[in-house]
Interface confidence: low
């Protein structure tokens, strides 16, 4: 039928930056790049009726349907969801085509189903049918990869049981400390999943999906470095597999390295040993204690021996459930308007947390560095001197953990004023918490330095929303001050604000902002 | 080796029910899903559906829905497919087959059951 | 649910010539992750399915280099560069995007 018009759905991802929640038909989000949903003529069906290529869409994703429409003339249109009408605003774009929208924030359940979208042009009445579902990720894992000896080698195999399954990486490096960061030119990755170069100084296993990445470090005892002030400690849960490599180098190949779990010689069966030449015709070693799964009596502290070095030892610590080790008592701060400072938390923890910032319902990325003595570290340094509450959560499989933080920004007050008939008020949010005086404005006083000291109420500080403190002060009007100018000044150990108020009869009240150092 | 061994041909009537087992072997039976297809005599493949053998999550096809139940036995790495309200057309060869991932690219098939209904 | 079509349905070689299979999806198989979720399967007759090609263009272990797939988002083509007796069979595209996982008519190559 040549009267019908060209029909062009599309589907438009958006980055989501917007915690709200509902159907609108205006772009409150950054798109991706509009994904064609094909739009074909239902066959069959009584009417002209398209139907689009089924939408599924990622939980809590926000998305645009649009339709794009090339007919002649003006367009009414209306969509119906679950037997209910929704507004729908058609506008043109620069090809004078006909647009139509229906944007779903934050996918949910009650979200999912078939959109209609009736449209009528000057020409022909016409349906389109959108059918949205939600991604089936209810099969989805990820969890974190573990190593196995793989059989009749010597080579390392990186497992991590997840679903969809992950793509596996090595991520080794050969240098110390902060060069051996992601994304450092000395990190080399390998997507496979067995190693065979065991011999390198940093070595991690990563997995990745669908619903991220997730790292196992293969725990390394130097035997040619200064051990650290604490002894290092490694915990795992029972029934997980546990892998310690002892590395060292000599001069030449004349010396053997041994463990022993609480002086007693590992079993054969739970080690193996591995040796090649460095530079300089020094030889390395390598020898790894593995336990399959482990059990309880597994704990304890294991140690490498070498014939020509210095042993050194790690604490084993095998528990039943994770944990998140802190102390969660609430931190208050208070700090200058331009002073550096962070908030930090120091905890152990096991499996690794995840682990988030808040302020003010949004949050930020955390990040958390391992210490020395086992302890790891977060810190939050971008606060922008916004006084308020900070929330700190981390999380793991088995346990949770939050810490709240109050920062308080000394500065001078800065003072508001409201007046009604019978009253008028002043706040302000300086910090420390301000005292109040009112002063009234006459003949006698003209500098405005009589004080007032009946009807004044201070009220007690009032905490805005996020942990903002605000004080306030409420003069009742009297005849005595009827008609005349009154100052209201807060002040703290930075500074004092006042603003003036004319107490008038009922009607709109002038106010004069007046600030004094 | 990796293998998938099915259980034998089954002859059922109009209305009963089937069910076809697929034992795995030769590798961790939990790390790969497992799904089920279908091919009437003659005719191309059909995809019936999924199970997820490290905790049991299935997905159907639309088509199977409501007839169609997929388990799995840890202890004896085998999975299982069932049948029920069978009719002519159902009569198919059903074969099980892994999954590297759960986005298809099945590396691995049974050798098929042969499923007949008649009465 | 997404629909595969395949073409030719039928596939006459001459040994030792080239042969090249198209398959069509009716949406785009590219997912966000950079991959296209497109698989090749060969029924030998009398025999069960075989992976031949996952991911597009990634030859399964154990499949001969003769074999290779190429295309992205909605066309794909499955070639084989000197095809060999035992290459008979049906040849399936399957999308595995979105469930239900659907596979193409089939095509079946047969020598000449």
């Known amino acids: 039928n040549q009267d019908l018009p060209v029909i062009k759905c599309v589907l438009i991802n958006h980055k989501n930056n917007d915690s709200s929640v509902g159907k609108s038909s205006s772009y409150p989000m950054v798109s991706e790049s509009p994904e064609d949903l094909g739009c074909a003529l239902r066959p069959q069906s009584s009417g002209t009726v398209y139907e689009a290529a089924a939408v599924e869409v990622d939980v809590s994703a926000s998305i645009t349907l649009q339709v794009l429409v090339d007919a002649p003339g003006n367009i009414s249109c209306l969509w119906v969801f679950k037997h209910s009408s929704l507004n729908c605003q058609p506008h043109f774009d620069l090809q004078n085509r006909g647009v139509v929208s229906m944007v779903i924030l934050k996918m949910t359940e009650t979200q999912a189903g078939e959109y209609l979208l009736f449209i009528q042009s000057e020409a022909t009445n016409y349906t389109i049918l959108f059918t949205v579902s939600i991604r089936n990720t209810l099969l989805y894992t990820l969890r974190r990869p573990y190593f196995r000896k793989m059989e009749n080698q010597d080579a390392l195999v990186c497992i991590s049981e997840s679903v969809p399954e992950p793509i596996v990486e090595w991520v080794l490096c050969d240098s110390q400390g902060e060069s051996c960061k992601e994304e450092s030119p000395a990190v080399v990755k390998k997507e496979e999943k067995v190693l065979h170069e065991l011999f390198g100084m940093d070595i991690r296993c990563c997995a990745r999906n669908e619903l991220g990445r997730e790292c196992t470090r293969l725990f390394t005892i130097d035997l040619n470095q200064t051990p650290q002030t604490t002894l290092p400690q490694l915990f795992l849960k029972v029934g997980e597999p546990l892998w310690i490599r002892c590395k060292a180098v000599h001069v030449n190949h004349g010396f053997g390295l041994t463990w022993e779990l609480e002086n007693k010689a590992l079993e054969e069966g739970n080690y193996f040993e591995m040796s090649t030449y460095s530079t300089n015709r020094t030889m390395i070693r390598i020898l790894f204690a593995f336990v399959s799964s482990v059990a309880r009596n597994d704990t304890g502290y294991y140690t490498c021996s070498s014939s020509k070095h210095p042993s050194q030892s790690a604490l084993v610590t095998i528990v039943e459930k994770g944990f998140i080790n802190a102390t969660n008592s609430s931190e208050d701060y208070e700090i200058d308007q331009y002073e550096e400072f962070c908030f930090s938390v120091r905890f152990k923890a096991y499996p690794q947390i995840r682990c988030t910032w808040t302020f003010s319902r949004k949050s930020f990325p955390c990040e958390q560095k391992g210490l020395d003595n086992g302890y790891s570290i977060s810190k939050f340094c971008n606060h922008k001197h916004q006084p308020g509450e900070y929330i700190f959560h981390a999380e793991n499989d088995d346990a949770q953990f939050t810490k709240m933080f109050t920062l308080n920004i000394r500065r001078k007050p800065q003072v508001l004023a409201e007046a009604s008939a019978s009253q008028a008020s002043c706040f302000s949010d300086g910090y420390p918490l301000p005292s109040w005086t009112w002063k009234k404005c006459s003949d006698k006083s003209p500098n405005c330095t009589e004080e007032i000291t009946e009807g004044v109420w201070n009220r007690k500080a009032n905490r805005k929303v996020f942990g903002q403190w605000v004080s306030s002060s409420t003069l009742n009007m009297s005849e005595a001050i009827k008609g005349f100018l009154v100052k209201c000044c807060a002040y703290n150990s930075l500074g004092t604000s006042c603003e003036t108020i004319l107490l008038n009869s009922p009607g709109p009240f002038p106010f004069i902002q007046d600030n004094i150092s | 080796q990796v293998q998938l061994v099915q259980s034998g041909a089954e002859v059922k009537k109009p209305g009963a029910s089937v069910k076809v087992s697929c034992k795995a072997s030769?590798?961790?039976?939990?790390?790969?899903?497992m799904h089920w297809v279908r091919q009437a005599p003659g005719q191309g493949l059909e995809w019936m559906g999924i199970?997820?053998?490290?905790?049991?999550?299935?997905v159907y096809a639309q088509t199977f829905q409501g007839r169609v139940t997929m388990t799995r036995d840890t202890s004896t790495s085998t999975v299982y497919m069932e049948l029920s309200s069978l009719r002519s057309e159902d009569t198919a060869v059903y074969y099980c087959?892994?999954?590297?991932?759960?986005?298809?690219?099945?590396?691995?098939w049974g050798q098929g059951t042969m499923v007949t209904v008649s009465s | 649910d997404i629909v595969m079509t395949q073409s030719p349905l039928s596939l006459p070689v001459t040994p030792g010539e080239p042969a090249s299979i198209s398959c069509r999806s009716s949406?785009?198989?590219?997912?966000?992750?950079?991959?296209?979720?497109l698989d090749w399967y060969l029924q030998k007759p009398g025999q069960s399915p075989q992976l031949l090609i996952y991911?597009?263009?990634n030859r399964a272990s154990g499949v001969p280099d003769r074999f290779s797939g190429s295309g992205s988002g909605t066309d794909f083509t499955l070639k084989i560069s000197r095809v060999e007796a035992e290459d008979v069979g049906v040849y399936y595209c399957?999308?595995?995007?979105?469930?239900?996982?659907?596979f193409g008519q089939g095509t079946r190559l047969e020598i000449k």
């Open positions: 087959a892994r999954g590297i991932g759960s986005k298809g690219a099945f590396d691995i």
């Open positions: 030769g590798y961790t039976f939990t790390s790969y899903y």
């Open positions: 199970i997820n053998p490290s905790g049991g999550s299935t």
């Open positions: 949406q785009s198989l590219l997912h966000s992750n950079g991959y296209n979720y």
């Open positions: 991911l597009g263009s």
């Open positions: 399957m999308q595995g995007l979105q469930t239900p996982y659907t």
